[in-house]
Interface confidence: low
């Protein structure tokens, strides 16, 4: 299967019911502290506001946040760690009425309440220490 380049940036239009699907694998073993970062941006620029920031510190924790006017807001942290060292995973981010719900390998693990309207999301960027095999947005 061919790999997508990382950082992977894609123009999107999201609404309630949309799903962002990502299939990837950590590039290095957890001992070397790889990260995964997914950012839902409000413009096609990497320094724009972020409606949903999802960062995995593999083997450690997950952090979710938003960034408005270049200011990071209150962080939401989870110690849930369903990701396996060296294993491919499927990440699905569901856009619900009131929140983003993040599923890993078919199970719901994380929730993040909307702070910025979903309709303002223009771009999704997937990056950091992963090999990316799939990125898909379905509405």
């Amino acid at each position: 299967m061919s790999l997508l380049s990382v950082p992977h940036t894609e123009s999107v239009s999201l609404s309630t019911g949309s799903t962002v699907t990502i299939e990837a694998r950590p590039l290095v073993c957890f001992f070397n502290e790889p990260h995964l970062q997914v950012d839902f941006h409000t413009e096609m620029k990497e320094d724009s506001d972020i409606a949903f920031h999802f960062q995995v510190y593999f083997g450690n924790r997950v952090v979710m946040n938003s960034r408005e006017y270049r200011t990071w807001k209150e962080e939401v942290e989870s110690k849930n760690m369903p990701f396996q060292d060296g294993q491919e995973f499927e990440l699905r981010i569901l856009v619900l009425e009131d929140k983003y719900q993040v599923m890993v390998n078919g199970q719901a693990y994380y929730n993040f309440n909307h702070r910025i309207p979903v309709s303002s999301v223009k771009m999704v960027q997937v990056w950091r220490d992963i090999s990316l095999t799939k990125f898909n947005v379905s509405n």
Epitope: H35, D47, Y69, R70, T71, W72, K73, E75
Partner: antibody, heavy 116, light 112 residues
Framework: QVQLVESGGGLVQPGGSLRLSCAAS????????MSWVRQAPGKGPEWVSD????????YYADSVKGRFTISRDNAKNSLLLQMNSLKPEDTAVYYC?????????WGQGTQVTVSS | QTVVTQEPSLSVSPGGTVTLTCGLS?????????PAWYQQTPGQAPRALIY???SRHSGVPDRFSGSISGNKAALTITGAQAEDEADYYC????????????FGGGTHLTVL
């Protein structure tokens, strides 16, 4: 713990140049936007320049635009400020600072004096 | 040129309450300015107290609180202590680009 250590300050004549460095440790440097903030003697702090986490976007105060250049090396956990065409009014303590919610972490500062 | 205004000096008695304000030379401070507050003692770098109007940084005593009151941001110290004597600076976010974060001139607080 988080440490920001500035260096490179000193005495320079008007029109001269200096290159300030900030060595970062104790946090994931590549995740953070970084800033330079200066404070002239007896005055309040003044924002000088910002660079985003990836280094692709930079911002400058009007007072230094075209003379100062901010850059970073995420592999070396290093923030730089190249200062050219220095003026007496650039005399200040220069701090590097960062944080997801404003300037939470500060260095101890490095003194820059522009005088003939 | 945007000017952020603060009272040059204020005083408070130990145990008393004092409010420092942060305004704009033209216009009102709003939530979109994300007011923040910093404390500085002589010879030290500033210390972050409050961000995004009223969020306290970790380790900051709850006697420090932030708000927007009228057309200004405000920092209130309730039950002032001797160690609160310092210079206090506010910052306002003014939009991406030049001078996107502007510091106020500072308020020197004396605890008498």
């Amino acid at each position: 713990q988080v440490q920001l250590v500035e260096s490179g300050g000193g005495l320079v004549q008007p029109g001269g140049s200096l290159r300030l460095s900030c060595a970062a440790s104790g946090f994931t440097f590549g995740n953070y936007d970084m800033s330079w903030v200066r404070q002239a003697p007896g005055k309040g702090p003044e924002w000088v320049s910002d660079i985003n986490s990836g280094g692709g976007s930079t911002y400058y105060a009007d007072s230094v635009k075209g003379r100062f250049t901010i850059s970073r090396d995420n592999a070396k956990n290093s923030l730089l400020l190249q200062m050219n065409s220095l003026k007496p009014e650039d005399t200040a303590v220069y701090y590097c600072a960062t944080g997801y919610t404003g300037y939470y972490y500060w260095g101890q500062g490095t003194q820059v004096t522009v005088s003939s | 040129q945007t000017v952020v205004t603060q009272e040059p000096s204020l005083s408070v008695s130990p145990g008393g309450t004092v409010t420092l304000t942060c305004g704009l030379s033209s216009g009102s401070v709003t939530s979109s300015n994300y007011p923040a507050w910093y404390q500085q003692t002589p010879g030290q770098a500033p210390r972050a107290l409050i961000y995004s109007i009223n969020s306290r940084h970790s380790g900051v005593p709850d006697r420090f609180s932030g708000s927007i009151s009228g057309n200004k941001a405000a920092l209130t110290i309730t039950g002032a202590q001797a160690e609160d004597e310092a210079d206090y600076y506010c910052t306002l976010y003014m939009g991406t680009g030049s001078n996107n974060v502007v510091f106020g001139g500072g308020t020197h607080l004396t605890v008498l």
